[in-house]
Interface confidence: low
Amino acid sequence: MGSAALEILGLVLCLVGWGGLILACGLPMWQVTAFLDHNIVTAQTTWKGLWMSCVVQSTGHMQCKVYDSVLALSTEVQAARALTVGAVLLAFVALFVTLAGAQCTTCVAPGPAKARVALTGGVLYLLCGLLALVPLCWFANIVVREFYDPSVPVSQKYELGAALYIGWAATALLMVGGGLLCCGAWVCTSRPDLSFPVKYSAPRRPTATGDYDKKNYV
């Protein structure tokens, strides 16, 4: 596969991953109440996210409440907020860096420098994935630990929410996409013949040997 194809595929995966990360960050379903044993009339499921908590009645009625004070939040929620938002912003920066290093753009002149810019974009997406993975795994660890903690009442136990799964899928896409971008950039630096389009010049006069200059041919 040519580097341009790797670049496009990598960028598409990273953009989808970025969208997934934004979705995971905003969704209130980082943890959901585990047990639904009660009367369907009054039964309710609690969702908790980074920014708000929601109570969903069995009737389908949902009531959400944005967390009032940042200082009142637990350390893990504050840290998860910072890391997730950081990852989203880093992905935004990575997008511009990747576009600047892309073969189809003219922000940076073609050559090794452009390939290095593209490589930087790929690395940034990899970092973005790793950065997002930290709060996701941290949160999951807390939920699982509390689920098996005998000091937490049965009715107060939570399970992993949809947002965590979306987040994990998003980080996987970011890291795979970032990896493809890095591969594409590496191909550019190591095999220029597979990357930048050849600029053909007008044919020269035949050489003394009668052969055409072969430098423009693979």
């Epitope: 585990a34 047990f35 639904l36 044993d37 009660h38 009367n39 039964a43 937490v152 009442p153 049965v154």
Partner: antibody
Framework: EVQLVESGGGLVQPKGSLKLSCAAS????????MHWVRQAPGKGLEWVAR??????????YYVDSVKDRFIISRDDSQSMLYLQVNNLKTEDTAMYYC???????????WGQGTTLTVSS | DIVMSQSPSSLPVSVGQKVTMTCKSS????????????LAWYQQKPGQSPKLLIY???TRESGVPDRFTGSGSGTDFTLTISSVKAEDLAIYYC????????FGGGTRLEIK
Amino acid sequence: EVQLVESGGGLVQPKGSLKLSCAASGFTFNIYAMHWVRQAPGKGLEWVARIRSKSSNYATYYVDSVKDRFIISRDDSQSMLYLQVNNLKTEDTAMYYCVREGNWDCFDYWGQGTTLTVSS
Amino acid sequence: DIVMSQSPSSLPVSVGQKVTMTCKSSQSLLYTSNQKNYLAWYQQKPGQSPKLLIYWASTRESGVPDRFTGSGSGTDFTLTISSVKAEDLAIYYCQQYYRYHTFGGGTRLEIK
């Protein structure tokens, strides 16, 4: 009106077996966790076993003294709760109550009880 | 396991008198995340099944007369009957549902 009616109690010899039943009506049985609580003659209440709803994979819990001897089960289609009691001991003699775990996690409805007597 | 202790085991009272019975748990029943105490009180009249009176340590079950009041937090709880009536003759049990379910030994309310 919520009703829990126990049956199946009786006189059993030590090491014997029996199956206690509880017929539930007046509520959506399949979404509630259900329990068995017993009361020895002249004594206090002792929680015996719990079975959760289908949404919780029918998870079961037992008091240590009856683990490996008692089996709690349910049939949601019939709104029935069961307690299979095996390898009975004289100390299992008690009134056995079928109980619903209500919306506040505690026991909001109790049956009238069925008496199990273990004696040789 | 959480152990529940009730005192007194027997409480002779006169009709109209105010009574208080206590319940202690071997570990805190307060869950800080929701600020709820996982404790309930039940009344068992002679020859009858137990009946839920109070849950979350202080919330009266619907239909329970307001002379019954639950209070306390953490490990120490009380049930108060502001003015005892003859029909209150019963055994009162506290129960923790913080970690599975354990009952106290009961307090027998006897009318003098």
